[in-house]
């Protein structure tokens, strides 16, 4: 009894910002549900929590300084994670809890994916070139 | 338009097992769970249990742990109780009950008379 | 167990009353989402509880709008504006935030 979560092996975070669709064997339709990442293959880093239920608007946060925000399908959370460094670069895992109405259900842990962060090149603009040499 | 469809009343003798069925049409079945409800003669309305229609996973009131099983067929959309070692107490109406939103049996079968009796 | 107190246990009526039916609970029905989980159903002999009110105010499709729900916490209340023939039977509260969900003993709106 646990859902199943995919991901995408590996993902490269461009201009320090990524999407990261989990994708449920689930239909969170009508469900209270807390889903969330964590980062690193023991999943120590909770790195972003996604609130879902049907009275209220997704309730998105982090505890541990990671800019993320969340959005949600029937089967799916797609967490939007801004401004990585490239000592982030990690494996991040989906994990999903569906809290009500009973009963309880988690996920069996996912394979997950590699955020591969590629560093901002700051290279100098070509528009403005530098001192021209006789 | 939601209907939970019972199978028929039940006589059965102290210390059989009784198996009820309740077959969903009208909407998407593994979308909601279903709970089963008892209702002794003149008596108030008491939650068996809750189960999951997509895992099967289930939640029993513990004093119906034992007692009564919950399952699901999803390729016929019926969900299933089933109660053992029945005694006179097990004498009752029993429902089934849709779980919509906010914690609320939206939609009820129509009720299962089960008389225990030699 | 939440234990679910309803008075009182018979109203008689007549067509036409305002009535109020009261539902108390052991301890608060909210829970840590803040979504509070008490509902209202009218179970007419021979027929199946129906369910009139959900999340506590919240009227089911096709309730008509004599019924009001209201409450919080530990305090719930079902209102009946003008009482119809249709309205007589069993009036029954439902929490379903803590398990095992569990039912009020039940009203019986019955004629004077």
């Known amino acids: 009894n646990k859902i199943l979560v995919k991901q995408s092996p590996m993902l490269v975070a461009y201009d320090n910002a990524v999407n990261l669709s989990c994708k449920y064997s689930y239909n969170l339709f009508s469900r209270e549900f807390r889903a969330s990442l964590h980062k690193g293959l023991d999943s120590a880093v909770e790195v972003c929590v996604v609130y879902g239920n049907y009275s209220q608007q997704l309730q998105v946060y982090s505890k541990t300084g990671f800019n993320c925000d969340g959005k949600l399908g029937n089967e799916s959370v797609t967490f939007y994670l801004q401004n990585l460094y490239v000592n982030q670069t990690d494996i991040y895992f989906c994990k999903i809890e569906v809290m009500y109405p009973p009963p309880y259900l988690d996920n069996e842990k996912s394979n997950g994916t590699i955020i591969h962060v590629k560093g901002k090149h700051l290279c100098p603009s070509p528009l403005f070139p530098g001192p021209s040499k006789p | 338009e939601v209907q939970l469809q019972q199978s028929g009343p039940e006589l059965e003798k102290p210390g059989a097992s009784v198996k009820m069925s309740c077959k969903a049409s009208?909407?998407?079945?593994?979308?909601?769970?279903m709970n089963w409800v008892k209702q002794s003669n003149g008596k108030s309305l008491e939650w068996i249990g809750i189960i999951d229609p997509y895992y099967g996973a289930t939640t029993y009131n513990q004093r119906f742990k034992g007692k009564a099983t919950l399952t699901v067929d999803k390729s016929s959309s019926t969900a299933y109780m089933q109660l053992k070692s029945l005694t006179s107490e097990d004498s009752a109406v029993y429902y089934c009950?849709?779980?919509?939103?906010?914690?609320?049996?939206?939609?009820w079968g129509q009720g299962i008379s089960v008389t225990v009796s030699s | 167990d939440v234990v679910v107190t309803q008075t009182p246990l018979s109203l008689p009526v007549s067509f036409g009353d305002q009535v109020s039916i009261s539902c108390r609970s052991s301890?608060?029905?909210?829970?840590?989402?803040?979504?509070?989980?008490l509902s209202w159903y009218l179970h007419k002999p021979g027929q199946s509880p129906q369910l009139l009110i959900y999340?506590?105010?919240n009227r089911f499709s096709g309730v008509p709008d004599r019924f009001s729900g209201s409450g919080s916490g530990t305090d719930f209340t079902l209102k009946i504006s003008t009482i119809k023939p249709e309205d007589l039977g069993v009036y029954y509260c439902?929490?379903?935030?803590?398990?095992?969900?569990?039912f009020g003993s039940g009203t019986t709106l019955e004629l004077k």
């Open positions: 999340g506590i105010s």
């Open positions: 009208g909407y998407s079945f593994t979308d909601y769970n």
């Open positions: 009950a849709r779980f919509g939103f906010y914690g609320a049996m939206d939609y």
């Open positions: 439902l929490q379903g935030t803590h398990q095992p969900f569990t």
């Open positions: 301890q608060s029905l909210a829970n840590s989402f803040g979504n509070t989980y």
